[in-house]
C-alpha cells in the first residue's frame, strides 16, 4: 500500500514537472513574402530600460542565434538596423519594437526577444513567435511594397550594435504574468501591422516539448526512482 502510494506520488511529480516544461507558448503568424512583421516586446520594468536587448532565432537542436541587438546601454528610441531587421527601444513605455521588413520564405522560423543581463542568463520576453512566410503577395494595398518602403525611411545615422559573443543555450523563461501578479518578469504582447492574413494559434511542438520535458526531468526522476527502490530493497 505504502509502495503504491509512493509510486503515485512520483508519477504525479513527474507529470506535473512535464506539464510545467510545456508552458513555453508560441504565437503563430502567417505572412506573405514582402510583408513586414512588426513585433512589440513588452518588458514593463524600468530596471530593464537601458539593458541591451536582442532578437533571436531558435533553430531546432541549436542554441538561440542573435540576429540583431540594441546598443549597450540601450539608447532610447534610437533605431538599430541589421539588414532587414530594425530594433527600437522605447524606454519610457517599456517597449522593444522589432520590425522584419520585406519578408522572405527563408525567414520562416521561431523567434524571441531577450534582455541581456550578464552575468545572469538572458531574460526571454513572452511569447515566442512562430513566423511562417509564404510565397506570393496578398494584393492588399499597403501590405507589401509600401510597408517595406516606409520602414526604410530611417535616418542614415542608424547604427549596427555589437551583440554579445555568447548565446545562452538555455534562456531564462517564465510564464507570462497576469496583470497583477507580482513578478519581476517582463510580459509581452505581439502585434502586427500592415497584415491582412493573420493566424494567431498557440502552437505546442509536442515532440520537442515531450523530449525536452523528459530530458530535463529525467535526472530528478532517476534519483527519485533510485531512492524509492533503495527504500524497498531489504
Amino acid at each position: 500500500m505504502r509502495k503504491t502510494r509512493l509510486w503515485g506520488l512520483l508519477w504525479m511529480l513527474f507529470v506535473s514537472e512535464l506539464r510545467a516544461a510545456t508552458k513555453l507558448t508560441e504565437e503563430k503568424y502567417e505572412l506573405k513574402e514582402g510583408q513586414t512583421l512588426d513585433v512589440k516586446c513588452d518588458y514593463t520594468l524600468e530596471k530593464f530600460a537601458s539593458s541591451q536587448k536582442a532578437w533571436q532565432i531558435i533553430r531546432d537542436g541549436e542554441m538561440p542565434k542573435t540576429l540583431a541587438c540594441t546598443e549597450r546601454p540601450s539608447k532610447n528610441s534610437h533605431p538599430v538596423q541589421v539588414g532587414r531587421i530594425i530594433l527600437e527601444d522605447y524606454h519610457d513605455h517599456g517597449l522593444l519594437r522589432v520590425r522584419m521588413v520585406n519578408l522572405q520564405v527563408e525567414d520562416s522560423g521561431l523567434y524571441q526577444c531577450v534582455i541581456y543581463q550578464p552575468p545572469k542568463e538572458p531574460h526571454m520576453l513572452f511569447d515566442r513567435i512562430r513566423l511562417v512566410v509564404t510565397k506570393g503577395f496578398s494584393g492588399t494595398p499597403g501590405s507589401n511594397e509600401n510597408s517595406t518602403q516606409n520602414v526604410y525611411k530611417i535616418p542614415p545615422t542608424t547604427t549596427k550594435a555589437l551583440c554579445p559573443l555568447y548565446t545562452s543555450p538555455r534562456t531564462v523563461t517564465q510564464a507570462p504574468p497576469k496583470s497583477t501578479a507580482d513578478v519581476s518578469t517582463p510580459d509581452s504582447e505581439i502585434n502586427l501591422t500592415n497584415v491582412t492574413d493573420i493566424i494567431r494559434v498557440p502552437v505546442f511542438n509536442i515532440v520537442i516539448l515531450l523530449a525536452g520535458g523528459f530530458l530535463s526531468k529525467s535526472l530528478v526522476f532517476s534519483v527519485l526512482f533510485a531512492v524509492t527502490l533503495r527504500s524497498f530493497v531489504p
Epitope: 512588426d38 512589440k40 513588452d42 514593463t44 520594468l45 524600468e46 530596471k47 530600460a49 537601458s50 522605447y90 524606454h91 519610457d92 513605455h93 517599456g94 517597449l95 519594437r97 496583470s179 497583477t180 507580482d182 519581476s184 504582447e189 502585434n191 501591422t193
Partner: antibody, heavy 121, light 111 residues
C-alpha cells in the same frame, strides 16, 4: 498579497503643511514606480504625482495643480512612499491614495485604502 | 495635458441589460498600437478597482461581463449583462503621457 497602507492625513489650516506616508509590503518595492492619487469629496479621481525607480534616477512628475507645492519621495530601504504637502489650499481637501502600477506607464493595479486630508480654517 | 471626457455622466440600466460607457481622449493615447487607457470601478467608501487595462485586457479575477474596446482617442467599457453588484462609478485613465489623467466618471445605477 500586495499591501499599501497610507497614514499622516488629518485636519490642517490653509497654507499649512502635512506629510503623508505609505508603507508597502509583499512586493519588490524598489522595482516599481509609485503614485499618489486623490479624490475630493463627491468628485472624480485626480492623479497627483509619480516617482520612478532608482534605475530612472527617481524621476518625479506632478499634476499642474500641485506643482511646486507637493514633493513625492521614496525610501526603498524602508519600503516607504511619501508626499510632502506645503502651502495647502482648501481645494486640496481629499482622500489621498497610495498606488502601485504594473510597470512603465502601466495600469494602477494596487491601491491603498486612502488617508483623508482636510484643509480648513 | 490629455483630457478624458466620459459620457454619459450617469446611466440607469435594467438588470440583465447592457451598459455602455464612452471615454474620449483629446489626443491619441496610443504608442505604436498599444492603447495606454485603463478602466476602474469605484464603489462608495472604497478605493478604485482595476477592471480593464490597455483598452481591452480583462484584469485577473474580473468577470467576463466586463469588456473594453477602442484605440487612439475613442474607447468603450461594456457591461453585459448588468448585475446589481455593478452599481458604482466607473473611470477611464490614460498613462500614455504625463501628467496621467482620469475621466470625470460615469455613475451606473439600476433602474
Amino acid at each position: 498579497e500586495v499591501q499599501l497602507v497610507e497614514s499622516g492625513g488629518g485636519l490642517v489650516q490653509p497654507k499649512g503643511s502635512l506629510k503623508l506616508s505609505c508603507g508597502a509590503s509583499d512586493f519588490t518595492f524598489n522595482t516599481y514606480a509609485m503614485h499618489w492619487v486623490r479624490q475630493a469629496p463627491g468628485m472624480a479621481l485626480e492623479w497627483v504625482a509619480r516617482i520612478r525607480t532608482k534605475s530612472s534616477n527617481y524621476a518625479t512628475y506632478y499634476a499642474d495643480s500641485v506643482k511646486d507645492r507637493f514633493t513625492i519621495s521614496r525610501d526603498d530601504s524602508q519600503n516607504m512612499l511619501y508626499l510632502q504637502m506645503n502651502n495647502l489650499k482648501t481645494e486640496d481637501t481629499a482622500m489621498y491614495y497610495c498606488v502601485r502600477d504594473m510597470g512603465q506607464r502601466r495600469q494602477f493595479a494596487y491601491w491603498g485604502q486612502g488617508t483623508l486630508v482636510t484643509v480648513s480654517a | 495635458d490629455i483630457v478624458l471626457t466620459q459620457s454619459p455622466a450617469s446611466l440607469a440600466v435594467s438588470l440583465g441589460q447592457r451598459a455602455t460607457i464612452s471615454c474620449r481622449a483629446s489626443e491619441s493615447v496610443d504608442t505604436f498600437d498599444y492603447s495606454f487607457l485603463h478602466w476602474y470601478q469605484q464603489k462608495p467608501g472604497q478605493p478604485p478597482k482595476l477592471l480593464i487595462y490597455r483598452a481591452s485586457n480583462l484584469e485577473s479575477g474580473i468577470p467576463a461581463r466586463f469588456s473594453g474596446s477602442g484605440s487612439r482617442t475613442d474607447f468603450t467599457l461594456t457591461i453585459n449583462p448588468v448585475e446589481a453588484d455593478d452599481v458604482a462609478t466607473y473611470y477611464c485613465q490614460q498613462s500614455n503621457e504625463d501628467p496621467y489623467t482620469f475621466g470625470g466618471g460615469t455613475k451606473l445605477e439600476i433602474e
